[in-house]
Amino acid sequence: AFGISGVQKYTRALHDSSITGISPITEYLASLSTYNDQSITFALEDESYEIYVEDLKKDEKKDKVLLSYYESQHPSNESGDGVDGKMLMVTLSPTKDFWLHANNKEHSVELHKCEKPLPDQAFFVLHNMHSNCVSFECKTDPGVFIGVKDNHLALIKVDSSENLCTENILFKLSET
């Protein structure tokens, strides 16, 4: 798994990293849930999408998210996730033309309608964490991760490597 001790060195390079090419290396439709098995759901309300973190009823279908995976150049030779010298970044789209965006000013995660090429706020570095969970780090703000706060997704600043293991930034990407 990703070396926790290397996270500062690893993330320092994010501002300078550029996505190799414009095509994803792979795409996958997955359901997204928290470390504690709550589902991430998306609801259309007043012509905009809201994101919720909730327990589903027994037979309720999980929402699916299209993850697009990009390989990004990693300027240093630190060994991080992925191919040596490269790291995986993802965009997450729960419905056509809408992508998860990091709003760093509001510390929020929002769904925005936009066209390609997508802005940097839509890209997240994928980290392989313990218990086969993943975390999503903002490309635009290294050290800031998608997390769960008050039954919503929010941006959470992780200021020390110990906090990287905190459950509220861990997610499961499951086959649907």
Epitope: T26, Y28, N128, N132, V134
Partner: nanobody, 125 residues
Framework: QVQLVESGGGLVQAGGSLRLSCAVS????????MGWFRQAPGKEREFVAN????????YSSDSAKGRFTISRDNAENTVYLQMNSLKPEDTAVYYC??????????????????WGQGTQVTVSS
Amino acid sequence: QVQLVESGGGLVQAGGSLRLSCAVSGRTFSTLNMGWFRQAPGKEREFVANIGWSGGTTYSSDSAKGRFTISRDNAENTVYLQMNSLKPEDTAVYYCAADIKGLYFPRDARSFDYWGQGTQVTVSS
């Protein structure tokens, strides 16, 4: 590009054991989900076992769980399938597969991104 090379297959008598190996290169091994699948003649490819980058495992059935053990060595970039108490119905080509996407213990063949060329296991009665 991820390269997977299986070895360890062969002909064995019923009740015997084999240890399959899969050497992985091309991507940091410790970020990969690894799986073993098998395909018997005229049948679909079926899931046997997987192991997450964090070490947790799942198996296809109680039968496989009791007889087969998947493990990995992150220092050696290798995943293993130890198969004990083999039966004629275990005869198949065994494939190693890798998922780069960070999925939570994937079992569906379509969830895996890279595949080895396969190694033949034949169990005679």
